[in-house]
């Protein structure tokens, strides 16, 4: 499988919400010894690699924020945790996942990874990533609302491994 | 180990536009961080003025928005600042400086030696 | 924007005694968790030197006589024991909200 990033940037005023996506691609295996354990965190391009550094969002951890099950199934964080930090991570039946901010600040900005694991006899089999980043925009310059700016397809399927 | 090092004339004419080079050495401004500028009056106070991230993203302090402009150089990792307009006020010691960017904390962890400029005619 | 408030202008303490120095943020610097608050130290004719970040974090190479401390909108520096070397200004800085603002710096001398 692999994942893509359907936007690469994503350009948001202060105060604004913003749900940043990925979308989990290709055959998965839905038997019922595999899970997929899929998060989000921050990092940087890096001078080596993107995403191989994992940073908190808002002080929460990949761990914080991670989502566990199986195939294509549905499923959000846990609520009272993240919900406090103004953040909530959440997966549908098509394989799209997303981590919601809200009420943006300067120091939200930065390069967002989406990680998924697929996890079979609970032992880690593949792991890929997507990234994207999050630019908030302060002053005259801002915009009114979100602006979202398309990965190239040669981007928004990253297969990296994490 | 990352170095940062400004250039650009010492002395300004009023109402002309100041133009500060910041060179970086031992890190690519394109792979982590914002690059700032910051300076000096005499007096002591400082001031945070502007940064550009390694994005290309810029920030700029309000209070100067309409008359700065940073912007880069990234085959020469170098950053510039332009402050245009100035005044005899804009006299102060000029600092390039790397902060943290995109993470839990943000603060200034290597900074330039500094150039100073007077605005005089 | 958010003022910094440092206190006290000048300061002169014996050598081997605690140097105290405080800043107050006239709204609070918190985000999710971390004091966005930093302490330089700056030496004549040199840049400032990042001492602590987000209020009580040591930067690598720093001696541990340097101790940061405080939350919301109260923080403190303290030097102890004070060296000959700790002859400097001392500036905090928030990096809550833009503009990111500096305080107006703390000289201490020895007595």
């Known amino acids: 499988f692999k994942v893509a990033t359907p936007y690469s940037l994503y350009v948001c005023p202060e105060g604004q919400n913003v749900t940043l996506t990925c979308r989990l691609l290709g055959p998965v295996d839905k038997g019922h010894d595999v899970t997929f354990y899929k998060t989000w965190y921050r990092s940087s391009r890096g001078e080596v690699q993107t995403c191989s550094e994992r940073r908190p969002i808002r002080n929460l951890t990949f761990q914080d924020l991670h989502l566990h099950h199986g195939g294509h199934q549905a499923a959000n964080t846990s609520h009272d945790l993240a919900q406090r930090h103004g953040l909530e991570s959440a997966s549908d039946h098509h394989g799209n996942f997303s981590i919601t901010m809200r009420n943006l600040t300067l120091l939200d900005s930065g390069l967002y990874c989406c990680l998924v694991v697929e996890i079979r006899h609970h032992h880690s089999e593949h792991r890929v990533h997507g990234a994207m980043e999050l630019q908030v925009q302060t002053g005259k310059d801002a915009p009114s609302n979100c602006v979202v700016y398309p990965s190239s397809s040669q981007d928004s399927e990253n297969i990296t491994a994490a | 180990e990352v170095q940062l090092q400004e250039s650009g004339p010492g002395l300004v004419k009023p109402s002309q536009s100041l133009s500060l080079t910041c060179t970086v050495t031992g890190y690519s401004i394109t792979s982590d961080y914002a690059w700032n500028w910051i300076r000096q009056f005499p007096g002591n106070r400082l001031e945070w003025m502007g940064f550009i991230s390694y994005s290309g993203f810029t920030t700029y302090s309000p209070s100067l928005e309409s008359r700065i402009s940073i912007t880069r150089d990234t085959s020469k990792n170098q950053f510039f600042l332009q402050l245009i307009s100035v005044t005899t006020e804009d006299t102060a010691t000029y600092y390039c400086a790397r902060n943290h960017y995109g993470g839990s904390y943000w603060y200034f962890d290597v900074w330039g030696a500094g150039t100073s400029v007077t605005v005089s005619s | 924007d958010i003022v910094m408030t440092q206190s006290p202008g000048s300061l002169a303490v014996s050598l081997g005694q605690r140097a105290t120095i405080s800043c107050r943020a006239s709204?609070?610097?918190?985000?999710?968790?971390?004091?966005?608050m930093q302490w330089y130290l700056q030496k004549p004719g040199q840049p400032p030197k990042l001492l602590i970040y987000a209020a009580s974090n040591v930067e690598s190479g720093v001696p541990d006589r340097f101790r940061g401390s405080g939350s919301g909108t109260d923080f403190s520096l303290n030097i102890h024991p004070v060296e000959e070397d700790d002859i400097a200004m001392y500036f905090c800085q928030q990096s809550r909200k833009v503009p990111w603002t500096f305080g107006g710096g703390t000289k201490l001398e020895i007595k």
């Open positions: 709204e609070s610097v918190e985000y999710y968790g971390t004091s966005l």
